[in-house]
């Protein structure tokens, strides 16, 4: 058993049918010695008396808010949460496996640049009685500071019969140099509590591996005289690291017909313009990627050919 | 260490091309190592990220773009020097950069070259003959060093009398390739910045 926060305790249980559970001793936070009784949650049934209460915690029915009283007055509370260990592996019931980029990915994180700011998000089908708390650091043995905000509900989607809820959090490394070569990964730890169930999820990454630039901005077309060709031009996104000559991007320009089946023409360039043939009803899209370190491509910025 | 001698070059910043080749070569080699050594811990998540140049060179600090010198987090161990010669720089463009930066890059390359050659010698003794260093990568390191044109003491290749532990050597190869790839990215960024300056 360990303390999650004041008066909230997590009991770690080896979770299998008929498991013996864990013996837990609760102590009433009071100078009083006599006439103390204990109850669980809203029940008025007296579970025991005395300054300490010894319980065998086996299932969720044994978890909850234990309260010690004296003469109708509440003295203190202890909330017991359960953390299930199923065959040596901590349970992951609360969050959905996003399966990207690999199986068992519960937290996904992205950064728009090398400033040390990043966003993480996760999915759940649970809509109520759910709280999250996020901590982060650079490295784990001698951790350096990363400050995270509060997790907020950022999106709701309908997936088949289920509703899916997306939560996200923004974090900022306290003293980040965009040009630094990372040798210690960023660690992100999310505590999730659903009713009386506690779970924790972690992710470890280098900022360089989670870079995803914003799409190029000011995408424009300039028709070339007496030709079906157009000059496409664009600019680096505002959120990208500067100077751009040091933090360079490379670009992919795509001409896509109305039908998804039509052949796509693609051009790769390090410049911020390209000459392409504009077909009728086609659209031109441009996306960006770090020129020197192949992390994710940005989303497409698009303009119609007409 | 001798300071570099500037050789006027009216054309494009000549080291940019070499540094791009370097990044391509080390990325290819790392990919090959990951595939060939699939049963070894060779991914970015599995290896310890060691930097053999730590405390010996200061490439990131010495080559910091002027725009980032205002960022206190980038200035922890910054040694500033505005001596600006080096054959990669056309003489009229030298005012933006430090010789320290280019000499630091040169020292990095030299250290990695020695490590890679020592390691290759060990890998050649492996009866499994599982993986060797790409000669193209070694050649590209050499070409960039020549383009940088620093005269510096040759570091003798480390020789080891004891029987090599091939498992450890292969893991060390992965660690070295990951670190060198990250340094090659920095070098490429620096060359691109200098080319634009």
């Amino acid at each position: 058993i360990w303390e999650l926060k004041k008066d909230v305790y997590v009991v770690e249980l080896d979770w299998y049918p008929d498991a013996p559970g864990e013996m837990v001793v609760l102590t009433c936070d009071t100078p009083e010695e006599d006439g103390i009784t204990w109850t669980l949650d809203q029940s008025s049934e007296v579970l025991g008396s005395g300054k300490t209460l010894t319980i065998q915690v086996k299932e969720f029915g044994d978890a909850g808010q234990y309260t010690c009283h004296k003469g109708g007055e509440v003295l203190s509370h202890s909330l017991l949460l359960l953390h299930k260990k199923e065959d040596g592996i901590w349970s992951t019931d609360i969050l959905k496996d996003q399966k990207e980029p690999k199986n068992k990915t519960f937290l996904r994180c992205e950064a728009k640049n090398y400033s040390g700011r990043f966003t993480c998000w996760w999915l759940t089908t649970i809509s109520t009685d759910l709280t999250f708390s996020v901590k982060s650091s650079r490295g784990s043995s001698d951790p350096q500071g990363v400050t995270c905000g509060a997790a907020t509900l950022s999106a709701e989607r309908v997936r088949g019969d289920n509703k899916e809820y997306e939560y996200s959090v923004e974090c900022q490394e306290d003293s980040a140099c965009p040009a630094a070569e990372e040798s210690l990964p960023i660690e992100v730890m999310v505590d999730a509590v659903h009713k009386l169930k506690y779970e924790n999820y972690t992710s470890s990454f280098f900022i360089r591996d989670i870079i995803k630039p914003d799409p190029p901005k000011n995408l424009q077309l300039k028709p070339l005289k007496n030709s079906r060709q157009v000059e496409v031009s664009w600019e680096y996104p505002d959120t990208w690291s500067t100077p751009h000559s040091y933090f360079s991007l490379t670009f992919c320009v795509q001409v896509q017909g109305k039908s998804k089946r039509e052949k796509k023409d693609r051009v790769f360039t390090d410049k911020t313009s390209a000459t392409v043939i504009c077909r009728k009803n086609a659209s031109i899209s441009v996306r960006a990627q770090d020129r020197y370190y192949s992390s994710s491509w940005s989303e497409w910025a698009s303009v119609p050919c007409s | 260490r001798n300071l570099p001698v500037a050789t006027p070059d009216p054309g494009m910043f000549p080291c940019l091309h070499h540094s791009q080749n370097l990044l391509r070569a080390v990325s290819n080699m790392l990919q090959k190592a990951r595939q060939t050594l699939e049963f070894y811990p060779c991914t970015s998540e599995e290896i310890d990220h060691e930097d053999i140049t730590k405390d010996k060179t200061s490439t990131v600090e010495a080559c910091l773009p002027l725009e980032l010198t205002k960022n206190e987090s980038c200035l922890n161990s910054r040694e500033t020097s505005f001596i600006t010669n080096g054959s990669c720089l056309a003489s009229r463009k030298t005012s933006f950069m430090m010789a320290l930066c280019l000499s630091s890059i040169y020292e990095d390359l030299k250290m990695y070259q020695v490590e890679f050659k020592t390691m290759n010698a060990k890998l050649l003794m492996d009866p499994k003959r599982q993986i060797f260093l790409d000669q193209n990568m070694l050649a590209v390191i050499d070409e960039l060093m020549q383009a940088l044109n620093f005269n510096s003491e040759t570091v003798p290749q480390k020789s080891s009398l004891e029987e090599p532990d091939f498992y450890k050597t292969k893991i060390k190869l992965c660690i070295l390739l990951h670190a060198f790839r990250i340094r090659a990215v920095t070098i490429d960024r620096v060359m691109s910045y200098l080319n634009a300056s």
Epitope: D14, W15, Y16, P17, D18, A19, E59, F60, K85, E86, D87, G88, I89, D93, K102, N103, K104, T125 | F39, P41, E46
Partner: antibody, heavy 115, light 112 residues
């Protein structure tokens, strides 16, 4: 004590369907994940499928994906395996099993796929 | 499709020490704990070892398990005639959990 009693096995022709049941008692069935494992005659153990305690997530071996469906009825304390498009290579003893460091197995039920 | 490799058979005379190996990889045994099962003919598997080296109550102490790196082993110290059975190791793969990964199985024969 914990008990898992299986039923539903038998002889079936290729291409046909069969449903296996596993009735649980002696524990809070709705709190635990459950597996199906099979063993072809003279062969080793092969995992077939898993279902979470609340039925929210199901996982399948590639060899049965799209043909077999694992389900549970927590109100009846019963686990099911619906098997469709059966093949000769599905012939095996099928076991249900609780998920956890200490596990309990059903007695097994034989499924024979033969024409 | 078995990723955990065991020797097909091992044998020993009563009182001898018999060991069975189970070889896997970084993503399974290297990252997760190992269980061992005993299966007597015509019966369901019985748990002998969980968590690499833990014995459930009721399992004789002549059975012991260990794990090192990407391999695990089961030792029967002072093998007895009633130990003649098939033995399976089991673990998980970190990418496909909760799918169970079983070893190929080992037939233990007690001679004489």
């Amino acid at each position: 004590q914990v008990q898992l009693v299986q039923s539903g096995g038998g002889v079936v022709q290729p291409g046909r369907s069969l449903r296996l049941s596993c009735a649980a008692s002696g524990f809070t069935f709705s709190s635990y994940g459950m597996h199906w494992v099979r063993q072809a005659p003279g062969k080793g153990l092969e995992w077939v499928a898993f279902i979470r305690y609340d039925g929210s997530n199901k996982y399948y071996a590639d060899s049965v994906k799209g043909r077999f469906t694992i389900s549970r009825d927590n109100s009846k304390n019963t686990l099911y395996l619906q098997m469709k498009s059966l093949r000769a290579e599905d012939t095996a003893v099928y076991y249900c099993k609780t998920h956890g460091s200490h596990d309990n197995w059903g007695q097994g039920t034989m499924v024979t796929v033969s024409s | 499709s078995y990723v955990l490799t065991q020797p097909p058979s091992v044998s020993g005379t009563p009182g001898q020490r018999v060991t069975i190996s189970c070889s896997g990889g970084r993503s399974n045994i290297g990252s997760n704990s190992v269980k061992w099962y005993q299966q007597l003919p015509g019966t369901a598997p019985k748990l002998l070892i969980y968590g690499n080296d833990q014995r459930p109550s009721g399992v004789p102490d002549r059975f012991s398990g260990s794990k090192s790196g990407t391999s695990a082993s089961l030792a029967i110290t002072g093998v007895q005639a009633e130990d003649e059975a098939d033995y399976y190791c089991q673990s998980y793969d970190r990418g496909t959990h909760p799918a169970l990964l079983f070893g190929t199985g080992t037939k233990v024969t007690v001679l004489g």
